[in-house]
């Protein structure tokens, strides 16, 4: 089981939206995963994925959780606040038979105030 | 910070239920599961199951199968556990814990004392 | 159910001295072992999660250690206020299973 995890780095301005990607890869067929999003080591949502389903779209506050199969995990925060501000990490577990776990590498999201006299645009930094 | 608050212990008659109550504060109550263990007097910890409050998911124990019913209630923020069919062998404390950030249990309840005794 | 055997299921020793636990796991549960000391009369509480990992706030004196089928929980120094029974779980398969407890004891 392996997560990768983007972008590095996102700044967006206050109100906009960020969007956050993770892309799970798993030798072995899955009955049913678990992926999770944390934001400065707090757990926002933990959902499962049966079927290539995903059982729970909200993921924190103003967090939409998206599944696009086979392996693309969207999180999505809409409008953003000041307090979305941190450091995110995607995880994912299987559970049966035996448990797997793998984390993504941290997503270090910004959120600039609302300020009109600033005309800052949205940087995003991807590995590789 | 992290509360788990069990409801008051309980005496019960063979072959009736129990419902334990655990009310979770100072985090989000839909983000974590919330496990359940026991305690048989002056025995280890027997693990009965979870659930995941954020969609209402459980996972059980197999040994209690049929008997145990976790769930919960988001408005609350309140897990439960019902223990039906009890014997004297489920005389025990059982406990409510929450799952860390991986998989561990970072807190517990106080504990609820069940006695079944006719 | 994979079963968990710790040893000893007691000990004693003198405060200040080095202690050794050990948990044996009936078949491979890789690292995902964890480990909780529970005083008398208290609830459980973690020490150590993922074999070795030290949780917030439990003091450097506690280690563990192992991988596979064979785990080890080291007190360092032991203090009086480690007088607790302690137990080992495995996390690696449903369902997840204990030992059944080392009781320590100060000389």
């Known amino acids: 089981l392996s997560v990768q995890q983007g972008p590095n780095l996102l700044q967006v301005r206050q109100g906009s939206q960020a969007t956050l990607v993770c892309q799970v890869d798993q030798a072995t067929a899955w009955e049913r995963l678990r992926v999770k999003w944390t934001k400065d080591g707090a757990i926002l949502c933990q959902p499962y994925i049966t079927n290539g389903s995903l059982s729970l779209g909200v993921c924190g506050p103003q967090g939409r959780l998206s599944w696009q199969a086979p392996s693309h995990l969207t999180l999505q925060l809409d409008p953003v606040s000041l307090n979305h501000s941190g450091a995110y990490v995607c995880w994912a577990a299987v559970e049966i038979p035996e448990l797997e776990e793998a984390e993504g590498n941290i997503t270090r999201l910004f959120v600039d105030p609302d300020d009109p006299t600033q005309n800052r645009n949205r940087i995003a930094s991807f590995p590789g | 910070q992290v509360q788990l608050v069990q409801s008051g212990a309980e005496v019960k008659k063979p072959g009736s239920s129990v419902k334990v109550s655990c009310k979770a504060s100072?985090?989000?109550?839909?983000?974590?599961?919330i496990n359940w263990v026991r305690q048989a007097p002056g025995q280890g910890l027997e693990w009965m199951g979870w659930i995941y409050p954020g969609e209402g998911s459980t996972n059980y124990n197999e040994k209690f199968k049929g008997r145990v019913t976790i769930t919960a209630d988001k408005s609350t923020s309140t897990a439960y556990m019902e223990l039906s069919s009890l014997r004297s062998e489920d005389t025990a404390v059982y406990y409510c814990?929450?799952?860390?950030?991986?998989?561990?249990?970072?807190?517990w309840g106080q504990g609820t004392t069940v006695t079944v005794s006719s | 159910d994979i079963q968990m055997t710790q040893s000893p299921s007691s000990l004693s020793a003198s405060v200040g001295d080095r202690v050794t636990i050990t948990c044996r796991a009936s078949?491979?549960?890789?690292?995902?072992l964890n480990w909780y000391q529970q005083k008398p009369g208290k609830v459980p509480k973690l020490l150590i999660y993922y074999t070795s990992r030290l949780h917030s706030g439990v003091p450097s004196r506690f280690s563990g250690s192992g991988s596979g089928t064979d785990f080890t929980l080291t007190i360092s120094s032991l203090q009086p206020e480690d007088v607790a029974t302690y137990y080992c779980q495995q996390v690696n398969t449903l369902p997840w299973t204990f030992g059944g407890g080392t009781k320590v004891e100060i000389k």
């Open positions: 814990a929450r799952r860390g950030l991986r998989y561990y249990f970072d807190y």
């Open positions: 078949q491979d549960i890789r690292n995902y």
């Open positions: 100072g985090y989000t109550f839909t983000s974590y599961d």
